[in-house]
């Protein structure tokens, strides 16, 4: 987890200004209005390798 | 630090009621989505019913095998979680755990309540 | 509703040994981006403990010899060298759809 203004998340999720962390980016099928998930519309999901081994 | 803790459990005779209760604290319980899993003695873990949030109008779910004798809900003011329990029955004889999550998976758990239903 | 299946229910293995357990759903679970696949594990008399979420992010202060994998309907827990803690019985649990199902779990007990 990120403070703002210092390194981003970490591929695949996104910062939430209202939980004050980083949240999951595949939380947002469950919760698309989300603060967080403008962030993950702009960011690749997690790497192809690590859904499809 | 992320706590929370069920009460209520306890015996009953079939047919009864009981009201859990779950008391949360260390996270931001009003935007959390809130579940109750049961686990019968021995056995695997069974969800029970879920309720989402205010934005959502409290929206609630059901297990099957609860519908219609189970009640969840939420005191978002008071960082509560709570289950009516009515026309108990011996299988739903189980420990019953308080989960809160932001979706998906169940990141909180309580140490559980056990509920006996038994004559 | 969706079936979680299992496998095995029980295995008994050696602290340092690498284990691994199999999860079937009985449909798909992913979309082209995530899989809504979790797993946890339980000791006895505690609480479920969340290990993995979306098939293979691995939770905050859980150890890195554990990992996850999968995508559709099969999913693997691997413990890479187990240790004398890690004995106790793992689950795994969709989130496509109301209801959530768990699998029935699988005891991972001592050689």
């Known amino acids: 987890e990120q403070a703002p203004g210092t390194a981003p998340c970490s591929r695949g999720s996104s910062w939430s200004a209202d939980l004050d962390k980083c949240m999951d980016c595949a939380s947002c099928r469950a919760r698309p209005k989300s603060d967080f998930c403008l962030g993950c519309a702009a960011a690749p999901p997690a790497p192809f390798r690590l859904l499809w081994p | 630090q992320v706590e929370l803790v069920e009460s209520g459990g306890g015996l009953v005779q079939p047919g009864g009621s009981l009201r859990l209760s779950c008391a949360a604290s260390?996270?931001?319980?009003?935007?959390?989505?809130m579940s109750w899993v049961r686990q019968a003695p021995g056995k695997g873990l069974e969800w029970v019913a879920e309720i989402r949030l205010k934005s959502d109008n409290y929206a609630t779910h059901y297990a099957e095998s609860v519908k219609g004798r189970f009640t969840i809900s939420r005191d978002d003011s008071k960082n509560s979680l709570y289950l009516q329990m009515n026309s108990l029955r011996a299988e739903d004889t189980a420990v019953y755990y308080c989960t809160g999550y932001y979706a998906d998976a169940m990141d909180y758990w309580g140490q559980g309540t056990l509920v006996t239903v038994s004559s | 509703d969706i079936q979680m299946t299992q496998s095995p229910s029980s295995l008994s293995a050696s602290v340092g040994d690498r284990v691994t357990i199999t999860c079937r759903a009985s449909?798909?679970?992913?979309?082209?981006?995530?899989?809504?696949m979790h797993w946890y594990q339980q000791k006895p008399g505690k609480a479920p403990k969340l290990l993995i979420k979306?098939?293979?992010n691995l939770e905050s202060g859980v150890p890195s010899r554990f990992s996850g994998s999968g995508s559709g309907t099969d999913f693997t827990l691997t413990i890479s060298s187990l240790q004398p803690e890690d004995f106790a019985t793992y689950y795994c649990q969709h989130s496509w759809e109301i209801p959530y199902t768990f699998g029935g779990g699988t005891k991972v007990e001592i050689k």
């Open positions: 449909q798909s679970v992913s979309t082209s981006s995530y899989s809504y």
């Open positions: 260390g996270f931001t319980f009003s935007s959390y989505w």
């Open positions: 979306y098939a293979s």
